[in-house]
């Protein structure tokens, strides 16, 4: 039979520059010699001949004089390979391969890592700051391998996700350097974080930023918007109401106006220097321009959706700035539900019946009550689903089992918490002969 | 380190156009505005415009809308501007200048001299 | 537009003398005001941002105040290198201006 050779499963893991060993065993009969050997290394994919051992001799290394065996250790099995100063390029399958008078091979995976340096954030521009101004934050790591992930987040640790790019260049040796840009609005002040992982070292490298855009003296701009969530039915519009008082000979010029989402500082709609930049969100969103200079600063959303749920940031920056948060709770009414009854024939006092109760397209999910026809809850052995669909909105299927009496009457209550709204079905069982669905 | 490299002194006739260069390095192109600025012999300062790097997004000078077409070819990290039906009053030192509110790096400027 | 009234428009000083230069704005700005410092043949350079703020590697004896529509840039002691012509500008609003220029010039 085959000789067997034996090699780690995982891949082994190689700093650049340190040594690694690539083990590799197979267990010698009694009376073996090393003049009845024949071992070779060779990079897997290509064949090329790493290091081998035939004849009772050290044949040396085929490759840049980085390989070496363990000559102590071959007589009782072990073929493992010494590989120095190990490289980028040295990442890969090398193949061991081991004859006496059978013969057999093993693949061993050898992963190459560099860690990455400290991250070194640069800001631009970095001086005369306002609120409401662009600015560019660039995030540099060096001679780090594999390429890295890069993750930015604000202070509250929230991942920042919109407007970054990242580029990854390999150097002659093969390490990476990474330089990640974040282009982000200022608000009032806000830290940046910048992490730069290691996927192979499982290695975090981070830094962080904080800016403080200038103040003015003559105080911060009152910003005022509802205190209560604003509710918006899914496909209509909503109108986020957002102020700012004015002061005397106030030109939309001086005005820097910007909504973003609260959590991920994404931009979504933006007014600077007398113009309306536009929608950012989708092409769904627009101001009232013929009332900000009134001091109308309110954004209206159109075709709403369940994503658009949250809090929206609005900001307002004049000479200086305020800012202050509206949420938007978006809802959906539930469908009147309609009621199946199993079994729904020949049934009599006593049988266990499954009543299904489903109504569908409604958000957020869905508060399911049963009672029976005296209006008495019904709450044992009833089980309820909600299932989203692509579109956020909610199917809500409650099942309850339940022994019949001689007759009786069965309601489902499907309440909408948001809007208070509630829709309901029942079904009357009645006595012998029963068929279904029976009028409620 | 910063710099603002502009193209070379141009002589127009009346009734053409110049296109102005400005080749941007030491900094992220994209991450400043860019301004140009117009001075007459002996005169002051101004203002003609500014583009965002980052999106092409302009703003002009009034003054200015009808005769100077500002652009960027990231890729080069070079602003341009284009002067159009060139008189003589558009004889002057033209620079660019990096910036939102402050200037702080100017280019060498360039002369165009409008003669017939 | 904002309009920036500069004056001196022009004046003589000699080296050690402490000069004053003001800006008028046609409306309140707050402090988004620049100074600017040209020599002959030269672009213009970066002295003083809002209103006050030294632009790094501008000598301490450039100093600036004001808010509103009234500002100064002071030269505590004038040296040889700082004949040249002086501009303020707006930064408030768009268009950006700038003032006339003050020519200082060697007595």
């Known amino acids: 039979g085959a000789l067997e050779v034996q090699v780690p499963e995982d891949p082994v893991v190689a700093l650049v520059g340190t040594d690694a060993t690539l083990c590799c065993s197979f267990s010698p009969e009694p009376g073996f010699s090393l003049a009845q050997l024949n071992l070779i290394w060779q990079l897997t994919d290509t064949k090329q001949l790493v290091h081998s051992f035939a004849e009772g001799q050290d044949q040396g290394s085929a490759y840049a004089n980085r390989t070496a065996l363990f000559p102590d250790l071959l007589a009782q099995g072990n073929a493992s390979l010494r590989l120095q100063r190990v490289r980028v390029a040295d990442e890969g399958s090398f193949t061991c391969f081991v004859s006496i008078r059978d013969f057999g091979s093993a693949a061993v995976s050898l992963q190459v890592a560099a860690p990455y340096s400290k991250p070194s954030m640069t800001l631009e521009p970095n001086k005369d700051l306002r609120p409401g101004d662009t600015v560019t934050i660039t995030c540099s790591s060096y001679q780090g391998y594999p390429e890295a992930e890069v993750f930015w987040q604000d202070g509250q640790g929230v991942p920042l996700t919109g407007n970054v790019t990242t580029s990854q260049m390999a150097n002659e040796q093969g390490l990476f350097d990474v330089h990640s840009i974040l282009r982000v609005v200022l608000g009032a002040n806000g830290t940046y974080s910048c992490l730069v992982r290691n996927p192979v070292l499982q290695q975090d490298a981070h830094s962080s930023v904080t800016i403080t855009p200038q103040r003015s003296p003559t105080g911060a701009v009152e910003v005022q918007v509802p205190e209560d969530p604003v509710v918006a039915l899914v496909g209509t519009d909503a109108t986020l109401r957002c102020s700012f008082s004015p002061e005397p000979g106030f030109s939309l010029a001086q005005l820097n106006l910007i909504w973003q989402l609260t959590d991920t500082k994404q931009l979504v709609h933006s007014f600077t220097e007398g113009r309306d930049q536009g929608s950012a969100y989708a092409n769904r969103t627009a101001l009232f321009p013929d009332l900000l200079a009134q001091g109308n600063a309110s954004l209206r959303l159109q075709r709403v959706r369940v994503a658009d749920e949250g809090s929206f940031t609005c900001f307002v920056s004049i000479r200086d700035f305020g800012s202050a948060a509206v949420s938007l709770q978006v809802a959906a009414p539930y469908s009147k539900p309609s009621m199946t009854l199993e079994p729904n024939k020949d049934l009599r006092p006593g049988d266990t019946v499954t009543i299904t109760c489903s109504s569908y397209r409604g958000y957020p999910e869905a508060e399911v009550f049963w009672q029976d026809g005296q209006g008495v809850p019904l709450t044992g052995n009833v089980t309820t689903s909600q299932m989203a669909n692509e579109q956020g909105l909610f199917d809500v299927h409650s099942v309850l089992r339940v022994v019949l009496g001689a007759n009786g009457t069965y309601s489902c209550l499907v309440r909408n918490p948001v809007l208070q709204q509630d829709a309901h079905g029942s079904v009357t069982i009645t006595g012998q002969p029963m068929t279904f669905p029976p009028e409620a | 380190e910063v710099q603002l490299v502009q193209s070379g002194a141009e002589v127009k006739k009346p009734g053409s156009s110049v296109k102005v260069s400005c080749k941007a390095s030491?900094?992220?192109?994209?991450?400043?505005?860019m301004n140009w600025v117009k001075q007459r012999p002996g005169q002051g300062l101004e203002w003609i415009g500014r583009i965002d790097p980052y999106d092409s997004e302009t703003r002009y000078n009034q003054n200015f809308r009808d005769k100077a077409r500002l652009t960027v070819d990231k890729s080069s990290s070079t602003a341009y501007m284009e002067l159009s039906s060139l008189r003589s009053e558009d004889t002057a030192v033209y620079y660019c200048?990096?910036?939102?509110?402050?200037?702080?790096?100017w280019g060498q400027g360039t002369t165009v001299t409008v003669s017939s | 537009d904002i309009q920036m009234t500069q004056s001196p428009s022009s004046l003589s000083a000699s080296v050690g003398d402490r000069v004053t230069i003001t800006c008028r704005t046609s409306?309140?700005?707050?402090?988004?005001l620049a100074w600017y410092q040209q020599k002959p043949g030269k672009s213009p350079k970066l002295l003083i941002y809002n209103a006050n703020t030294l632009e790094e590697g501008v000598p301490s004896r450039f100093r600036g105040s004001g808010s509103g529509t009234h500002f100064t840039l002071t030269i505590s002691s004038l040296q040889p290198e700082d004949f040249a012509t002086y501009f303020c500008?707006?930064?408030?609003?768009?268009?950006?201006?700038f003032g006339g220029g003050t020519k200082v010039e060697i007595k």
């Open positions: 200048a990096r910036g939102v509110r402050i200037f702080d790096y």
């Open positions: 409306e309140n700005i707050d402090y988004t």
């Open positions: 030491g900094y992220t192109f994209t991450a400043y505005w």
């Open positions: 500008k707006q930064a408030y609003d768009v268009p950006r201006t």
